[in-house]
C-alpha cells in the first residue's frame, strides 16, 4: 500500500522537510503532489512525468518545492502556513491511479531565551528570588537547569506562569550557582546563557583554633599564642579582635609572642558582613600559668550572635 512518510514530522520554521513515498506501484508513469487531503486541480503543487523526467509546477507551487524521480517531495525554508496534509497521486499505465496522504507540522523557530532576575545577590533566609525566562512563546515548554542539572525537588522551588517563572523562596547558600532556562517545542529547543546567583550569607558563628608554638597541651609562660578565627560568610567577613574588651587588629589570625600571665583574659573574635548586615562573635577565656600545667583554653567558651 502506498504510504507517505514525513522526515521530520515536526519541522522548525525555516528548515526543510522531505515527504517520502513508500511502496510505489511498478507500473507508474507519473506523479502529482497536492496541498491538502484530496486531489484538486487548484491545489496542485507539481506534476512529474517519469518518461521525460519533466516537472510541471501547479497553482500551489511556491518555488520552494522539488520533486524527485522516486516521487519524494522536498520543501525548503518552510513556514507555519506549510503545516498540514499533502497528497501524492501516482498515475499508472492502467490509469487506475493510487493516492496517499501524509502530513507534517511546522513550529516557529525558537528565539534564544534570556533570564531576568529580581535579585541576583539575595541574602540567605531573608530574600526570595524570581527568575523569569523570556520571551513568552505560545505552545512552548519551559525547562530550568541549575548547575547543568534539572531542577531538584524542593518545597522552596516554585514554578509558575507556565513554568516561565522560577521562584526560590527564602534562599539558602546552596542555591548559589548557574541558572539556565530552555524553551522547547516538538521541532527544536534553545537554551539561555547562564545567570549566576550569588547568595550572600553569614557570617556564621566563628570558631577559634588555638595553635600553640611549640605545640603543647597547656599555655605556659613564654609560649607563642596563635589564635585563628574562621567564619563561613559570603562575602568573606571582616575580622577583628578584642582582648579584655580592647580593640586589637583586623586580621584573621591573632599572634602574641612569648605570652605571660599578663595575657590572661577574654579573647573575642568579631566577624562582620556589610552585605548581609549581620555580625557574629566568639569569646574564649585564656589562662597562662607561670610554670607547671595550666587549664589553657577554658571549656566555657561562648559566642554572641547579632543581626
Amino acid at each position: 500500500k502506498l504510504t507517505i512518510e514525513s522526515t521530520p514530522f515536526n519541522v522548525a520554521e525555516g528548515k526543510e522537510v522531505l515527504l517520502l513515498a513508500h511502496n510505489l506501484p511498478q507500473n507508474r508513469i507519473g506523479y502529482s503532489w497536492y496541498k491538502g487531503e484530496r486531489v484538486d486541480g487548484n491545489s496542485l503543487i507539481v506534476g512529474y512525468v517519469i518518461g521525460t523526467q519533466q516537472a510541471t509546477p501547479g497553482p500551489a507551487y511556491s518555488g520552494r518545492e522539488t520533486i524527485y524521480p522516486n516521487a519524494s517531495l522536498l520543501i525548503q525554508n518552510v513556514t507555519q502556513n506549510d503545516t498540514g496534509f499533502y497528497t501524492l497521486q501516482v498515475i499508472k499505465s492502467d490509469l487506475v491511479n493510487e493516492e496517499a496522504t501524509g502530513q507534517f507540522h511546522v513550529y516557529p523557530e525558537l528565539p534564544k531565551p534570556s533570564i531576568s532576575s529580581n535579585n541576583s545577590n539575595p541574602v540567605e533566609d531573608k530574600d526570595a528570588v524570581a527568575f523569569t525566562c523570556e520571551p513568552e512563546v505560545q505552545n512552548t515548554t519551559y525547562l530550568w537547569w541549575v548547575n547543568g542539572q534539572s531542577l531538584p525537588v524542593s518545597p522552596r522551588l516554585q514554578l509558575s506562569n507556565g513554568n516561565m517563572t522560577l521562584t526560590l523562596l527564602s534562599v539558602k547558600r546552596n542555591d548559589a550557582g548557574s541558572y539556565e532556562c530552555e524553551i522547547q517545542n516538538p521541532a527544536s529547543a534553545n537554551r539561555s546563557d547562564p545567570v549566576t546567583l550569588n547568595v550572600l550569607y553569614g557570617p556564621d558563628v566563628p570558631t577559634i583554633s588555638p595553635i600553640i608554638s611549640p605545640p603543647d597541651s597547656s599555655y605556659l609562660s613564654g609560649a607563642n599564642l596563635n589564635l585563628s578565627c574562621h567564619s563561613a560568610s559570603n562575602p568573606s567577613p571582616q575580622y577583628s579582635w578584642r582582648i579584655n574588651g580592647i580593640p586589637q587588629q583586623h586580621t584573621q589570625v591573632l599572634f602574641i609572642a612569648k605570652i605571660t600571665p599578663n595575657n590572661n583574659g577574654t579573647y573575642a573574635c568579631f566577624v562582620s558582613n556589610l552585605a548581609t548586615g549581620r555580625n557574629n562573635s566568639i569569646v574564649k577565656s585564656i589562662t597562662v600559668s607561670a610554670s607547671g600545667t595550666s587549664p589553657g583554653l577554658s571549656a566555657g567558651a561562648h559566642h554572641h550572635h547579632h543581626h
Epitope: P235, Q238, Y239, S240, H250, T251, F255, L274, A275
Partner: antibody
C-alpha cells in the same frame, strides 16, 4: 610603628622591566596582605594587584595580567612588584600599601612611593 | 569591574564651610567604601572605611555616609590643612577601584 620602605627611583627604556621592592616592619609581615597602586603624573590612583605574604597568593587587575608579577621574601619581610614590557604610559609613582585587615578592608599604611620613568 | 565616579572633580570653599563630596558605584557595594586624603607631594592617607568608620586619629570634622551605590564624604568645617585631593575606593573584593579624585581648595 608600621613602616613600608620602598626602593629608589628607576629610569627604564620602553620594552624593559622594572622590579620595585617594599620592605615591611613594625608588624607581623605574614598577617596583612600587601597591595600595589600606581599614580601617573597629575593623575588619580590605579590599583595593580595584591599579594598574600603568608601564602604567596596573588591577584592582579585585568589590565596588568601577563605583565606584572608580585613575589615576597618572608625572611626579609619584603614584597616585590615586577612590571615588564614597559611603555611610556607606565611612567608613574608606584606605591605598596598594607590592607587594614583581612578580607574587604581598605589600605591603611602606604610606602613612600617609587617613581618609575619610562623614556627612550 | 566596579566603576567609581566622584563629583565634583574640584571645588573651592571658604574656611569654616561645610564641604560635601559624592561618590557613586556602578553596582551595589553595600558599605564597603573608603575615603582617602592625598596632600600635594604626599602619600594617600586613609580617612574612613566601611562608608562611615573614622580611622583613629582623623579629625571628627570628617564624616562618611551612604550605602549601596551612593556615598558622601563631608567636611563639616573646612580647615586650611584640608587642602588636598580626596579619593573614594570600594573595598568590596578585588579588583579595587578608585574614584577619579576631588581637588579641594580654599577660596
Amino acid at each position: 610603628q608600621v613602616q613600608l620602605v620602598q626602593s629608589g627611583a628607576e629610569v627604564k627604556k620602553p620594552g624593559a622591566s622594572v622590579k620595585v621592592s617594599c620592605k615591611a616592619s613594625g608588624y607581623i609581615f605574614t598577617s596583612y596582605w600587601l597591595h600595589w597602586v600606581r599614580q601617573a603624573p597629575g593623575q588619580g590612583l590605579e590599583w595593580i594587584g595584591y599579594i598574600n605574604p603568608q601564602t604567596g597568593y596573588t591577584s592582579y587587575a585585568q589590565k596588568f595580567q601577563g605583565r606584572v608579577t608580585m613575589t615576597r621574601d618572608t625572611s626579609t619581610s619584603t614584597v616585590y612588584m615586577e612590571l615588564s614590557s614597559l611603555r611610556s604610559e607606565d611612567t608613574a609613582v608606584y606605591y605598596c600599601a598594607r590592607e587594614y585587615g583581612n578580607y574587604n578592608y581598605p589600605l591603611d599604611y602606604w610606602g613612600q612611593g617609587t617613581l618609575v620613568t619610562v623614556s627612550s | 569591574d566596579i566603576q567609581m565616579t566622584q563629583s565634583p572633580s574640584s571645588l573651592s570653599a571658604s574656611v569654616g564651610d561645610r564641604v560635601t563630596i559624592t561618590c557613586r558605584a556602578s553596582e551595589n557595594i553595600y558599605g564597603y567604601l573608603a575615603w582617602y586624603q592625598q596632600k600635594p607631594g604626599k602619600v594617600p592617607k586613609l580617612l574612613i572605611y566601611n562608608a562611615k568608620n573614622l580611622v583613629e586619629g582623623v579629625p571628627s570634622r570628617f564624616s562618611g555616609s551612604g550605602s549601596g551605590t551612593d556615598f558622601t564624604l563631608t567636611i563639616s568645617s573646612l580647615q586650611p590643612e584640608d587642602v588636598a585631593t580626596y579619593y573614594c575606593q570600594h573595598h568590596y573584593g578585588t579588583p579595587y577601584t578608585f574614584g577619579q579624585g576631588t581637588k579641594v581648595e580654599i577660596k
